[in-house]
């Protein structure tokens, strides 16, 4: 039942958080025009993977698309092609994840099969979260890099009587969204690989061995058929179960390296 | 068409608080912002406030801030300027215009005569 | 805020004349996201309302004469009437559209010579 409910909560986590990448990975407002400097600007710029937006404060907002390809930064390319990959992995871990599901009963799957494919998707969900996380992080710190130098120049050259006000770009909504859904989607991964551990059948299930001796009838039950049960104590069962839980630490620590880039 | 019209009270004395009203027709205000402009007797246009498409922001020339108040009311398609404390100084044409692509002024009304006399 | 400078402030012309007039600002007016530039034109007559020429420094808003243009970039702005017709004697006033307030020029009389 554990198992079931680990495997359904990981399976939903993983589609909001790769609904989220889409999301975000379609949302203009990857960075916004700072208006620290002019708070009650009649233009307001903003920008996002695809294209650029100008909101101006009559109502109207114009969107003009990137129509190139090489005059793009690379830094942009990349950040699209992390996302891109992201959003295929997801898609592609959510597909494999339905079918594993253990309430879902297809034809004769044994439990075996259900299992490998959790791991498989839960693997492809982390890798896909990890992308989105990556990709969120590059962009946002192509941002800050680029509003400082911005602010440096805003400094630069006012000695004249016409001031050239730069416009700089901050973090848009898109940002936290997309650190938000990788998030999600690399806890349902990291769920969905706790899961598949409790599908997996036991390496030893000996059956109940029943000696016949001399004048009694006794059923002798083995020690190993009260471990494969999953009560008691196994030394080895033991091991495979601390070593399950630093690698799902270390899957939720790694990707706060990029949280504050 | 478009249309707008300017309405008011042609004096007001000072101190009084003045009310103008904007009733527009022929386009839906969600789409475009709404302007107050005014022109003293023989001088140049002034921008006094705006209002915009979504009548969420609200802006106003900071010097009268204090005393100017842009509302819109859709059920009845106006746009209201309300002006506290008036001052002989205020004695203009008040001018309500559609705000469109560039935040240019493409619609005028034909603008109300206010005179601030004792 | 940003001031926004006209000149001349009194321009006499003949009917056929090339007239025009300049407009500066005290900042830029271009736009970095659409490259646009928001300065606006219009034309005032008197006792009348203001009417809209040019909006985005150079496109002609429709209706508008063809003997009508605007350009320039940044803070230098002109507006050109190639050929004076007797309806073009009036008041123009340029605007800042791009940072409130949305100031306007002194205005520039073009008037019969």
């Known amino acids: 039942m554990a198992v079931t409910a680990c495997q359904g909560l990981g399976f939903v986590v993983s589609l909001i958080g790769i609904a989220g990448i889409i999301a975000a990975t379609c949302m203009d407002q990857w960075s916004t025009q700072d208006l620290y400097n002019n708070p009650v600007t009649a233009v307001f710029n903003y920008q996002g993977l695809w294209r650029s937006c100008v909101r101006e404060s009559s109502g109207f907002t114009e969107c003009r698309g990137y129509f190139t390809l090489l005059g793009l930064p690379a830094m942009l390319q990349a950040v699209r092609a992390l996302m891109i990959v992201g959003i295929v992995l997801g898609a592609i871990g959510l597909l494999v994840s339905i079918f594993a599901l253990k309430c879902i009963r297809i034809g004769s799957m044994e439990d075996s099969a259900k299992a490998n494919m959790t791991l498989t998707s839960g693997i492809m969900f982390i890798v896909s979260g990890l992308c989105a996380i990556a990709g969120v992080s590059v962009f946002a710190n192509m941002l800050v890099t680029n509003f400082w130098m911005s602010t440096a120049n805003m400094y630069t050259g006012m000695g004249g009587m016409v001031q050239t006000v730069q416009t700089r770009y901050t973090f848009g909504a898109a940002l936290f969204v997309g650190w938000v859904a990788g998030g999600l989607t690399l806890i349902g991964g990291v769920m969905m690989c706790i899961a598949c551990r409790g599908l997996a059948p036991e390496e030893t299930n000996y059956k109940a061995v029943s000696y016949h001796a001399s004048g009694h009838s006794v059923a002798y039950k083995p020690g190993g058929f009260k471990a494969s049960t999953g009560f008691g104590s196994n030394t080895k069962n033991k091991k495979i179960y601390d070593g399950g839980a630093r690698t799902e630490d270390e899957v939720q620590s790694y990707p706060s390296k990029h949280d504050y880039v | 068409q478009v249309t707008l019209r300017e309405s008011g009270p042609a004096l007001v004395k000072p101190t009084q608080t003045l009310t103008l009203t904007c009733t527009f027709s022929g386009f839906t205000f969600s789409s475009y912002g709404m302007s107050w402009i005014r022109q003293p007797p023989g001088k140049a246009l002034e921008w006094l406030a705006t209002i915009s498409g979504g009548g969420s922001y609200t802006y106003y020339l900071d010097s009268l801030k204090d005393r100017f108040t842009i509302s819109r009311d859709i059920s009845k398609n106006q746009v209201v300027l309300t002006v506290t404390n008036m001052d002989p100084a205020d004695t203009a044409t008040y001018f309500c215009?559609?705000?469109?692509?560039?935040?240019?002024?493409?619609?005028w009304g034909q603008g109300t005569t206010v005179t601030v006399s004792s | 805020d940003i001031q926004m400078t006209q000149s001349p402030s009194t321009l006499s012309a003949s009917v056929g004349d090339r007239v025009t007039i300049t407009c500066k600002s005290s900042q830029s007016l271009l736009n970095s996201g659409n490259q646009k530039n928001y300065l606006t034109w219009y034309q005032q007559k008197p006792g009348k309302a203001p009417k809209l020429l040019i909006y985005w420094a150079s496109t002609r808003e429709s209706g508008v004469p063809s003997r009508f243009s605007g350009s320039g970039s940044g803070t230098a702005f002109t507006l050109t009437i190639s050929s004076l017709q007797p309806d073009d004697f009036a008041t123009y006033y340029c605007q800042n559209d791009y940072s409130y307030p949305l100031t306007f020029g002194g205005g520039t009389k073009v008037e019969i010579k």
């Open positions: 215009a559609r705000q469109s692509r560039g935040n240019a002024m493409d619609y």
